[in-house]
């Protein structure tokens, strides 16, 4: 495939992974769909650092962007060897797209570890810590879990679906990476008239 | 034997099974054949729980490297009079009691 | 303490001064049988469930304050004394146990 083809393809994939990464992230604010615990202390650790909002929404967004600019058509330098300037801009923001990528999983990874801050026999805490992620196979024991309500289901289906999507971002960060390093150095493969005139 | 205002660390050795990933008790029943929880450990020893009636005089610990659950009993009282189970909750955490240990006899006497 | 006979149906009630309903909606109930000289044993959690290796002749009802356990046939090895536990609110309370034996 064309490094231009790829990039674009790359990017409209990472920016779709951004926005389901902010909207998880947004949902561990709201246990259940309650608000009501959102200003307390009552979420855990994990929901704060934003994993999803920062590292796989924010962090990774500016790669998508790049990557499907890069996959535009014209720029500095005309012919095949155009979009260069717009490749290495992809190269710079694909890496910093990883680094996010990586904290996301980091923070979804450790989330799901510990598993939520909740109400278990009338004390507020990390009840499911010390279980190094042994809880998600015993989904008996959730229901000890008094306050937020269902928090342990919430949390777990939406960090869940954070670590797949930064390593999807990952996946796709370091695929760009490469394609976008290629189309640095060979340029794009499209024919001359696909350039603009 | 102990006499009141003394002090004992009770101990309970596992074996047969994973120690570390079972939330542990400890259970008393008295000379009146009456059962009563008296202190509950997370399987990691982060979390302890107790009823009013022990809380600040007995301390419940694990050592997962030894696969032993303690009960340290301090300021004894003449009603601390009782045998002592340990018993293991089903799960890291407060479930039910699936397995139960043979019993010690603690006697609080002048 | 319950006298019966042998063979015969025995219902052991439990009640509690206040509900036992867990805020996840379930209820911790658990029934136990201490038989002369050894360490108590569960039969049955969470209202109805039978723990492993317990004959279905035990069964568990009841919610809210009122709980039964039924043993449809009395066999010998069924006395001892029962004891329900409330697991659901700390601190957690034993019944004051119910006797069964040979009428």
């Known amino acids: 495939m064309c490094t231009g083809k790829c990039a674009r393809c790359v990017g409209l994939s990472l920016i779709t992974l951004c926005l389901v990464c902010i909207v998880a992230n947004a949902l561990l604010l709201v246990p259940n769909g309650e608000t009501s615990w959102t200003n307390t202390n009552h979420l855990s650790l994990q929901v704060w650092l934003m994993g999803g909002f920062i590292g796989g929404g924010l962090m990774v967004l500016c790669p998508g962007i790049a990557a499907v600019r890069a996959g535009g058509k014209g720029c500095c330098g005309a012919g095949c060897c155009g979009n260069r300037c717009r490749m290495l801009r992809s190269v710079f923001s694909s890496a910093f797209g990883v680094l996010g990528a990586i904290y996301c999983l980091s923070v979804s990874g450790a989330g799901l570890r510990n598993g939520p801050r909740c109400l278990m026999n009338g004390e507020w805490g990390y009840h499911f810590e010390d279980t190094a992620g042994a809880y998600l196979l015993n989904r008996t024991l959730w229901d000890r879990c008094e306050a937020p309500p269902r928090v342990v289901p919430w949390n777990v289906t939406l960090f869940s679906l954070l670590v797949a999507a930064s390593c999807l971002e990952i996946v796709l960060c370091g695929i760009q990476l490469v394609n976008a390093t290629i189309g640095v150095f060979c340029g794009d493969c499209r024919k001359k008239q696909d350039t603009p005139h | 034997l102990v006499k009141p205002g003394g002090s004992l660390k009770l101990s309970c050795a596992a074996s047969?099974?994973?120690?570390?990933?079972?939330?542990m008790s400890w259970v008393r029943q008295t000379p009146d054949k009456r059962l009563e929880w008296v202190a509950t450990i997370s399987s990691g020893g982060g979390y302890t729980y107790y009823p009013d009636s022990v809380k600040g005089r007995f301390t419940i610990s694990r050592d997962n490297a030894k696969n032993t659950l303690y009960l340290q009993m301090r300021s004894l009282k003449s009603e601390d009079t009782a045998m002592y189970y340990c018993?293991?909750?089903?799960?890291?955490?407060?479930?039910?009691?699936?397995?139960w240990g043979q019993g010690t006899t603690l006697t609080v006497s002048s | 303490s319950l006298p019966v006979s042998l063979g015969d149906q025995a219902s052991i009630s439990c009640r509690s001064s206040q509900s036992i309903l867990h805020s996840s909606g379930n209820t911790y109930l658990e029934w136990y049988l201490q038989k002369p000289g050894q360490s108590p044993k569960l039969l049955i959690y969470k209202v109805s469930n039978r723990f492993s290796g317990v004959p279905d002749r035990f069964s568990g009802s009841g919610s809210g304050t009122d709980f039964t356990l039924k043993i449809s046939r009395v066999e010998a090895e069924d006395l001892g004394v029962y004891y329900c536990f409330q697991g659901s609110h700390v601190p957690f309370t034993f019944g004051s146990g119910t006797k069964l034996e040979i009428k």
């Open positions: 047969g099974f994973t120690f570390s990933s079972y939330g």
């Open positions: 018993a293991r909750h089903e799960g890291f955490t407060t479930y039910y009691f699936d397995y």
